[in-house]
């Protein structure tokens, strides 16, 4: 028996369902009574789901996993993982035994898009050219950790005087706060880009300072 899984990681959005694909090639005359299937977490060896003696043994993992019972006889041993969480991320091994056995591992990469950044300015009034201002770009509820880029109105990267912090909440999602300290010119636009490296999703925010009033 030969087990096959997708080479590329499976990317799943938080709170959606994911399918970890695993297949084997059944011999002619194969019946489910011959199949022994185990899904486990590769690193910890924790049992996730199993099928043996022709019976689905059920989920051993948060009651959020399921097989595709009608497709098993065709060699489809894929696992459905419902309501994906950040903590589900990692490698899963599909073990199949019929007479011989084989196994293969598939990676699950969890992701969540970042919100459109909100921009704040400190101080936010009586601004004059030459003043030092602090611009904060905040984006929420993303995963994994973001990459943050700052640019001026001409698209020139601003790398100095940038401090970025990322804090995970109780669900493991990150809130990102990036602070740019800059000396004001006569007027200018400051843009922040928050990128999710897995989803290749960019969230943009900008602030334009034209004397008074401010434009966000």
């Amino acid at each position: 028996v030969e087990v096959q899984v997708s080479e590329d990681p499976v990317v799943a959005l938080v709170d959606t369902d994911a399918t970890l694909r695993c297949s084997f090639s059944p011999e002619p005359g194969f019946s489910l009574a011959q199949l022994n299937l185990i899904w486990q977490l590769t690193d910890t060896k924790q049992l996730v789901h199993s099928f043996t003696e022709g019976r689905d043994q059920g989920s051993a993992y948060s009651n959020r996993t399921a097989l595709f019972p009608d497709l098993l006889v065709q060699g489809n041993a894929s696992l459905r993982l419902q309501r994906v969480r950040v903590t589900d991320e990692g490698s899963y091994t599909c073990f199949v035994s019929i007479q011989d056995f084989d196994s293969a591992a598939v990676s699950l990469q969890v992701a969540a898009p970042y919100s459109k950044p909100s921009m704040t300015l400190e101080p936010n009034k009586d601004l004059r050219p030459g003043n030092m201002v602090t611009i904060t770009c905040s984006s929420y509820q993303g995963y994994p950790e973001a990459e943050v880029f700052w640019k001026d109105g001409q698209g020139v990267p601003l790398t100095g005087n940038v401090t970025t912090s990322q804090m995970a909440n109780e669900r493991g999602l990150f809130d990102v706060h990036s602070v740019l300290r800059v000396v004001l010119g006569a007027n200018g636009t400051y843009s922040c880009l928050v990128r999710n490296p897995v989803l290749q999703q960019d969230a943009h925010g900008s602030v334009t300072i034209t004397g008074q009033p401010l434009t966000f």
Partner: antibody, heavy 117, light 108 residues
Framework: DVQLVESGGGVVRPGESLRLSCAAS????????MSWVRQAPGEGLEWVSS????????LYADSVKGRFTISRDSSNNSLYLQMNSLRAEDTAVYYC??????????WGLGTLVTVSS | EIVLTQSPGTLTLSPGERATLSCRAS??????LAWYQQRPGQAPRLLIY???SRATGIPDRFSGSGSGTEFTLTISSLQSEDFAVYYC??????????FGGGTKVEIK
């Protein structure tokens, strides 16, 4: 007739290495998983390791993980067990067994490994 | 891992008597259980698999029964060659195969 013949046992010191071999005949070697099972003197049976028919998948008991390596060569119908960092508690008769659905339908006569200083 | 407990440790019987050997699993293994016989100085030999299916060439005086956590190997009428050690093995968790500690059947 299925035949399994182990070799390579002997006396070694703790920390040393040994390689066991098992010559198989009488069945389509590449179609079956193979295993090593050991038996310490006067004790019961302990599963050590298994390898799939293709050789692409392996399983190990926690007691030997990281020290023992199972392998096979279908060109000469042979099964191997490379044993490194041997300990006194590895002293046992090592049996080569043909696996079918994860039980063992044929066994060799075994080869004795003694780890002693 | 699944722990298999065999009882009794030793069974002392006469030829022609019935032997009943027990194997208890620490959790349900359905019928994923095999029995082996090991005579002194010999390799183990498969007797029963799937809790109740006799292996090729095994006499019908050997029978297996049970499912879940309780299993029995019965030898209906002991022959001289049946005096040996008997082991059960679970393969429900086939990633970590385990054996029972064995039951020795000796001549009275």
């Amino acid at each position: 007739d299925v035949q399994l013949v182990e070799s390579g046992g002997g006396v070694v010191r703790p920390g040393e290495s040994l390689r066991l071999s098992c010559a198989a005949s009488g069945f389509t070697f590449s179609s079956y998983a193979m295993s090593w099972v050991r038996q310490a003197p006067g004790e019961g049976l302990e599963w050590v390791s298994s390898i799939s028919g293709s050789g692409g998948s392996t399983l190990y008991a926690d007691s030997v993980k990281g020290r023992f390596t199972i392998s096979r060569d279908s060109s000469n119908n042979s099964l191997y067990l490379q044993m490194n960092s041997l300990r006194a508690e590895d002293t046992a008769v090592y049996y080569c067994a043909k696996a079918r659905n994860n039980f063992f339908d044929y066994w060799g006569l075994g080869t004795l490994v003694t780890v002693s200083s | 891992e699944i722990v298999l407990t065999q009882s009794p440790g030793t069974l002392t019987l006469s030829p022609g008597e019935r032997a009943t050997l027990s194997c208890r699993a620490s959790r349900s293994i359905l019928t994923s259980l095999a029995w082996y016989q090991q005579r002194p100085g010999q390799a183990p030999r498969l007797l029963i698999y799937g809790a109740n299916s006799r292996a090729t060439g095994i006499p019908d005086r050997f029978s297996g029964s049970g499912s879940g956590t309780e299993f029995t190997l019965t030898i209906s009428s002991l022959q001289s060659e049946d005096f040996a050690v008997y082991y059960c093995q679970q393969y429900y968790d086939w990633l970590t195969i385990t054996f029972g500690g064995g039951t020795k059947v000796e001549i009275k």
